[in-house]
Interface confidence: medium
């Protein structure tokens, strides 16, 4: 039970794609305003978004300090005129979020094949090794930075005449297929964390295809 | 199996300059940032400098004790990395390891033999 | 340039002992401390991430705590394969080993 002005957060979703990562909750507030702390199961609380008449927190910052930890998230409610009441325990109305592990659940964003080159009967397609919002020394670390061999790709490729797909894998960005010489052929690739349990696989990139200028080819 | 072989090293005189190499094979070399870490005579390890990947355009950052004197590269159509040193010290005699970075949580995770390198007169 | 000074240089102990070094940062490096641990003849292996994140397949008697300027690493209940030299590392801004610790057996 908290004050009679206000009520408390509900819905506390995790919104993370790519380590960018924002806590949302409801309700729209009316004569309220929220504040969100943000804590490993091991540490101290962190409050982030002071006095917000937002719904959502960017919780960014906090998360990718280490991804692998487990995160929990909290939303005060406090009156609006008056962010010192408290409910009737002595203590502002809050609601928990879920638990959160970056490492384990962030989405994987759409990835983007970066270039494709034929060599004869060969094609090497290069997949952009995305930046992600984790940074170390100055430098936005990428996807297989963070994730190293557990990132796969898997790519989907079939001539432009016809719907039959093949498909490849590979646990660098990069892929060496055989193709038929004077085909040409259509590329999308998937990043993939097998490992995984949830948010397996990301969306299919934008299909590329073989006459286009992202492409080289070399006899 | 990941692989990192150091050359290059020797006796060089005050002043003068040496260029290592380290051959880097079993992984995609691109996608890793690349270190250069050194260990003086009966001390401890210390930083040199490293490289970025191909994600970060392959910049580079020193600590302050060789900036200015040595630099790194990597020829990535031959898996190898290098660091330039000149304007040498004594100070600078130590074994240089080349070691692959994981930079999301600063582990050094392969590790070459290294090379030692001697500034004497 | 952010100094790491590392304490003490060396240390001899018991097996079944529990051994402490330290680490301090010359300015706030917030939790981004590693604890290496190297053996002759080997490349340094890294034990605990991020002050006291414990890296996959190391024992649970090593430790980390601390953050801002002062840290502990801790070996609870020291074993002989242990023996080591082991060091900080600084990862907040640039990279800055400790001096180390020569760990021994008594």
């Known amino acids: 039970s908290g004050t009679t002005n206000t009520v408390a957060a509900y819905n506390l979703t995790w919104k993370s794609t790519n380590f960018k990562t924002i806590l949302e909750w409801e309700p729209k507030p009316v004569n309220q305003v929220y504040t969100v702390q943000i804590s490993t199961k091991s540490g101290d609380w962190k409050s982030k978004c002071f006095y917000t008449t937002d719904t959502e927190c960017d919780l960014t910052d906090e998360i990718v300090k280490d991804v692998k930890q487990t995160y929990l998230a909290r939303v005060f409610s406090y009156p609006a005129g008056n962010v010192e009441s408290t409910g009737s325990a002595g203590e502002p109305l809050y609601e928990n979020s879920p638990e959160f592990t970056p490492y384990l659940e962030t989405n994987l964003g759409q990835p983007t094949i970066q270039s494709f080159e034929q060599v004869g009967t060969k094609v090497n397609v290069t997949v952009e090794d995305e930046r992600t919002l984790v940074r170390r020394n100055n430098t936005f670390l990428s996807l297989r930075d963070v994730f190293g061999k557990d990132l796969i790709y898997t790519l989907y490729y079939w001539k432009s005449s016809s719907s039959g797909k093949k498909t490849a894998k590979t646990n660098t960005n990069e892929f060496l297929i055989d193709v038929d010489k004077g085909e040409n052929y259509c590329f999308s690739v998937q990043a993939v964390i097998p490992s995984r349990t949830v948010n397996r696989k990301s969306t299919d990139s934008p299909v590329e295809c073989m006459g286009q200028e992202k492409g080289e080819f070399r006899e | 199996e990941v692989q990192l072989v150091e050359s290059g090293g020797g006796l060089v005189q005050p002043g003068g300059s040496l260029r290592l190499s380290c051959a880097a094979s079993?992984?995609?070399?691109?996608?890793?940032?690349m270190s250069w870490v050194r260990q003086a005579p009966g001390k401890g390890l210390e930083w040199v400098g490293f490289?970025?990947?191909?994600?970060?355009?392959?910049?580079?950052e020193y600590a302050a004790s060789v900036k200015g004197r040595f630099t790194i590269s990597r020829d990535n159509s031959k898996n190898s990395l290098y660091l330039q040193m000149n304007t040498l010290r004594t100070e600078d005699t130590a074994v240089y390891y080349c070691?692959?970075?994981?930079?999301?949580?600063?582990?050094?995770?392969?590790w070459g033999q290294g090379t030692l390198v001697t500034v004497s007169s | 340039a952010i100094q790491m000074t590392q304490s003490p240089s060396s240390l001899s102990a018991s097996v079944g002992e529990r051994v402490t070094i330290t680490c301090r940062a010359s300015q706030d490096i917030n939790k981004y401390l590693n604890w290496y641990q190297h053996k002759p003849g080997k490349g340094p292996k890294l034990l605990i991430y991020y002050t006291s994140t414990l890296q996959t397949g190391v024992p649970s008697r090593f430790s980390g705590s601390g953050s801002g300027t002062d840290f502990t690493f801790t070996v609870s209940n020291l074993q002989p394969e242990d023996i080591a030299t082991y060091y900080c590392?600084?990862?907040?801004?640039?990279?800055?080993f400790g001096q180390g610790t020569k760990l021994e057996i008594k």
């Open positions: 590392l600084q990862y907040d801004n640039l990279l800055t």
């Open positions: 079993g992984f995609t070399f691109t996608e890793y940032h």
């Open positions: 490289i970025r990947n191909r994600a970060n355009a392959y910049t580079t």
């Open positions: 070691a692959r970075l994981t930079m999301v949580v600063a582990e050094f995770d392969y």
